[in-house]
Structures are given as C-alpha cells and as structure tokens.
Amino acid sequence: MAVTACQGLGFVVSLIGIAGIIAATCMDQWSTQDLYNNPVTAVFNYQGLWRSCVRESSGFTECRGYFTLLGLPAMLQAVRALMIVGIVLGAIGLLVSIFALKCIRIGSMEDSAKANMTLTSGIMFIVSGLCAIAGVSVFANMLVTNFWMSTANMYTGMGGMVQTVQTRYTFGAALFVGWVAGGLTLIGGVMMCIACRGLAPEETNYKAVSYHASGHSVAYKPGGFKASTGFGSNTKNKKIYDGGARTEDEVQSYPSKHDYV
C-alpha cells in the first residue's frame, strides 16, 4: 500500500512539476525591466524566451516575437533548448509512468516490468527537473552578470551617438515558477525511484531442506537457510546468518522424500 501511495504521489507531484515547466517556458516574464530615462510615461518592459513586451502606464501593451533564430544570443538559445528537453523528457516520463502505476492493470504485466517502467519514468523526471532548474538558473545568471544594472555609457556609433539605456533588470515570475516546477519534478522523480524498489518482486522462495547424515544428530542447512516446510513460523524463508548447524532438538525437521539419498 505504501508503495502504491509513494508511486501515485510521485506521479502527481511530477505532473504538477511538468505543467509548471511548460507554463514557465511559455511565460513572457522571464526578465522585467524599468526604463528610467523616459520622461513621458513609466515604461515597463518584460521578456520571455519567445517574445518581448512593452507596457506603458497609459495601459498600452505591445509584444513582439523573436522571429529570427540565428541572430539571438547563444545563452537564450541554450535556455530554450534546456526547457524544451525538460518538457519532452517529462512528457515521455508521464506517459511511461501512467502504464507503470500499480493501481492500473494492463493485461498480464508483471511487477518486474512495472518496476522497470517506474524507475525509467523516475529517472526521466529527475533529468527533466534538472534541465528546468539548469535552464532557469542559466537565465538568472545571465541577468545577474550582464544586465543587473546597465550603466549609461555613451559612445559614438554609425549615424550619431549611442548610449545604453539605464535599466534595472529583475527576475521575472517565470524564473520562480521554473525553479519550483523543476524542484517538484525532481522530487516526483525521486519518489518514483523509491517506489520502484518496493515494486521489485521478492526473491524466489526456495524451501531449504534438512539433510540427515546417518549417525549424526545435526541438521545440515544449505546456504544458511532455516529449514522449514512452510508451515512453521518462518514462512518467508528468511536467511539466517547463524554460522552453522543446529541439533535436532533446536530445529525440528519433518521427514520428506528428500530426507534420505
């Protein structure tokens, strides 16, 4: 029951996480900026992985997509790639984990197959979460190192003078959504991997047999297994590392067709 709960919870947590990763990837607010040097109106700029938007205090908002691929910063392309890989892996992981759920019966699928599928999906969720966290962190680092406070430095360019606008770049909501979503997917993946251990079938129950040597009153136990017919207290045939034989008084053995060779 605990295994089913762990597996189910892992699936739900991962599902929420992947939904969050998709949401973060689509969001426009990866970085937000206040443009200081505009004397007319407060201008608020925010950018995502796919488009940039300008919003004015007057209520005017306009967004424009990055329609080119080659001209964009390499860092932006890397973040896009990481997020997409995270989504794809997460989606495949979800698909695999649906079939791996213990509460869902599909034909005569064995527990070992379900265990393998649970482990596979768990690993996929972990990698997916790491991709999302890495993507968001790379973008955040890009903001911190390059743009945290662009100083108004002037220089002469083609057609006149150029200066960088003094802007303050801050983390957008998408970064926090991405971090949380990546973390949830990662946790969900770990839970799936833990559930996999519980799903793996028990070792085959070998019934150990007592061999009686004539003239000796000791029970020989191959492999250190406690001799049992399956009716005694040790029905699971757990291995006992007791380092040797016991007398017949200590371990009662019942005659069987294998007792005498």
Partner: nanobody, 122 residues
Framework: QVQLVESGGGLVQPGGSLRLSCAAS????????MGWYRQAPGKQRELVAV???????NYTDSVKGRFTISRDNAKNTVYLQMNSLRAEDTAVYYC????????????????WGQGTLVTVSS
C-alpha cells in the same frame, strides 16, 4: 548597425512652419520612445518633445501648443510638426530613439541622429 536619419530642417521666417522627420533603420527589434531634442549655439541640449510607442506624448513648456510630435510605428519614423516658429527655436534638432536590437533583444539602447539645423530668421 542602426541609423537615425533626420530631414526637413532649413531656413524659415518667424511665424512659419516646418516638418521634421526621422527614420530609424537597421537591425532594430523594437523601438520604444522616440523624441526630438535641440541644442542652440552655446547652450545645453534640451528635450523638445517625446512620444512613446503607445502614443503618449510630452512637450517642453516653450513649445506646447505650437509643436506636434507623431510617429509611425510600422515605418520606425517620428515626425515633428513645428508651427508659429520663433527666433529662439533656432537650433540643431536631434532625433532620439530608445530601442533594442535583433541580436540582443534584452538590452535597451538610446540612439541619436546626426542632427538637422533649423534656422528661424527674417
């Protein structure tokens, strides 16, 4: 990379009119505010008028009611219609645009034109 080219300047009599235009070209991703500044001989450069992408405009007190700023976002062009010109309006008029580039849509730059001379004299 990016060029701002002003045109329309010249000599005009007091009370006359002129229409300045400024076209931005190059690898522009998005232009936010566009404006006109002027610098009279021996004076500091001052704001004349500025207009945002959404059409919100602002004017310096001395030109209010006489000058009108407008823009065409599709053409990346800003215009300054100057009416009832006075001698004190004589200056070099500079075009200004806040924009970001296609190669770096995360950083904003202010580009300036080379300027066009407006002389108001009888």
């Amino acid at each position: 990379q990016v060029q701002l080219v002003e045109s329309g300047g010249g000599l005009v009599q007091p009370g006359g009119s002129l229409r300045l235009s400024c076209a931005a070209s190059g690898s522009i991703f998005l232009i936010n505010a566009m404006g006109w500044y002027r610098q009279a001989p021996g004076k500091q450069r001052e704001l004349v008028a500025v207009i945002t992408r959404g059409g919100s405009a602002n004017y310096t007190d001395s030109v209010k009611g006489r000058f009108t700023i407008s823009r065409d976002n599709a053409k990346n062009t800003v215009y300054l219609q100057m009416n009832s010109l006075r001698a004190e309006d004589t200056a070099v008029y500079y075009c200004n645009a806040d924009l970001n580039l296609r190669s770096d849509p995360f950083k904003w730059y202010t580009f300036w034109g080379q300027g066009t001379l407006v002389t108001v004299s009888s």
